[in-house]
Amino acid sequence: SITGISPITEYLASLSTYNDQSITFALEDESYEIYVEDLKKDEKKDKVLLSYYESQHPSNESGDGVDGKMLMVTLSPTKDFWLHANNKEHSVELHKSEKPLPDQAFFVLHNMHSNSVSFESKTDPGVFIGVKDNHLALIKVDSSENLSTENILFKLSET
């Protein structure tokens, strides 16, 4: 369960892949599309508001009791729109939502490198936001060794 209804911190950043391709968002036919692309020199990067929430890890799984805290994030590139995990379609979509946000909008934050992060679906543990065919998709990761797989690693940057 999410410990509090308000985020413990928020962070406005551009999102890029481990290979430095930018994640961009475009409004098309009244819905947003998400792209993974190389930006031209001096082209402005899209920013995403990351909201960090504390979540208690289920103690029966962890044995940690109250000490098993995780960081959950929501990602919002524009007002009232958040990234959602569509676990049926294995896709990542932008949907307009009202608070409280559905579980599909929450992702468990990982960083298996000091300079990159991964986003694990709250509703489907072991499934991460990743890059597939120049789009964001949900990718199943079968072991902790594969958490360093480049297609699920993202960089956050203020610039």
Partner: antibody, heavy 121, light 106 residues
Framework: EVQLVESGGGLVQPGGSLRLSCAAS????????MYWVRQAPGKGLEWVAA????????YYPESVKGRFTISRDNAKNSLYLQMNSLRAEDTAVYYC??????????????WGQGTLVTVSS | DIQMTQSPSSLSASVGDRVTITCKAS??????LDWYQQKPGKAPKLLIY???NLQTGVPSRFSGSGSGTDFTLTISSLQPEDFATYYC????????FGGGTKVEIK
């Protein structure tokens, strides 16, 4: 209850080696970043090593790079620090610390009580 | 490497005083900053994380603020058990501690 217990400190001559251990209990060790932090007598805190939950990556400041190696055995809930080519300036209390959250390298939520390493001839 | 400059390095205060300690980062660290308290012969203890979030069990007289490069730890009314050394710590890029501030009894 989260517990971190360091061992392996002692007196060693300059140029010598020492291996510190940290026994962890009370939490899912394999889900957390782990760290070594040191404190020279009467001085401040200095981060000396960090390791990811799956031991895939490790990190060091320039002051110890190439001389110190952090490692972990998730099956044994144990963290290690191999220290080689020790110098007088490595004399310090060495603390083992655990990340505050599952899976992320943010904040040092729990600390052991430390083990003293003295490098002297 | 990110440098963290803490000031003052020491201060004398009385019980009931309002105490402010500052920490300056050499580059933007967003809100990726903690404060730790250490008493003589003891391990450090996490007080505040992500700039302004109180660790469980820490009294509400402690508070943190700031963003980017400038951060502050405030103790609103100093208590006898608060005489200790305080360290800031950044984890935005690598990991770095500030030099520490020793809070002594006046």
């Amino acid at each position: 209850e989260v517990q971190l217990v360091e061992s392996g400190g002692g007196l060693v001559q300059p140029g010598g080696s020492l291996r510190l251990s940290c026994a962890a209990s009370g939490f899912t060790f394999s889900s957390y970043w782990m760290y070594w932090v040191r404190q020279a007598p009467g001085k401040g805190l200095e981060w000396v090593a960090a390791i990811t939950p799956n031991a895939g990556e490790d990190y060091y400041p320039e002051s110890v790079k190439g001389r110190f190696t952090i490692s972990r055995d998730n099956a044994k809930n144990s963290l290690y620090l191999q220290m080689n080519s020790l110098r007088a300036e490595d004399t310090a209390v060495y603390y083992c610390a655990r990340g505050h959250y599952y899976y992320t390298s943010y904040s040092l939520g729990y600390w052991g009580q430390g083990t003293l390493v003295t490098v002297s001839s | 490497d990110i440098q963290m400059t803490q000031s003052p390095s020491s201060l004398s205060a009385s019980v009931g005083d309002r105490v402010t300690i500052t920490c300056k980062a050499s580059q933007n660290i967003n809100k990726h900053l903690d404060w730790y308290q250490q008493k003589p012969g003891k391990a450090p203890k996490l007080l505040i994380y992500f700039t302004n979030n109180l660790q469980t069990g820490v009294p509400s007289r402690f508070s943190g603020s700031g963003s980017g490069t400038d951060f502050t730890l405030t103790i609103s009314s100093l208590q006898p058990e608060d005489f200790a050394t305080y360290y800031c710590f950044q984890y935005n890029q690598g990991w770095t501690f500030g030099g520490g501030t020793k809070v002594e009894i006046k």
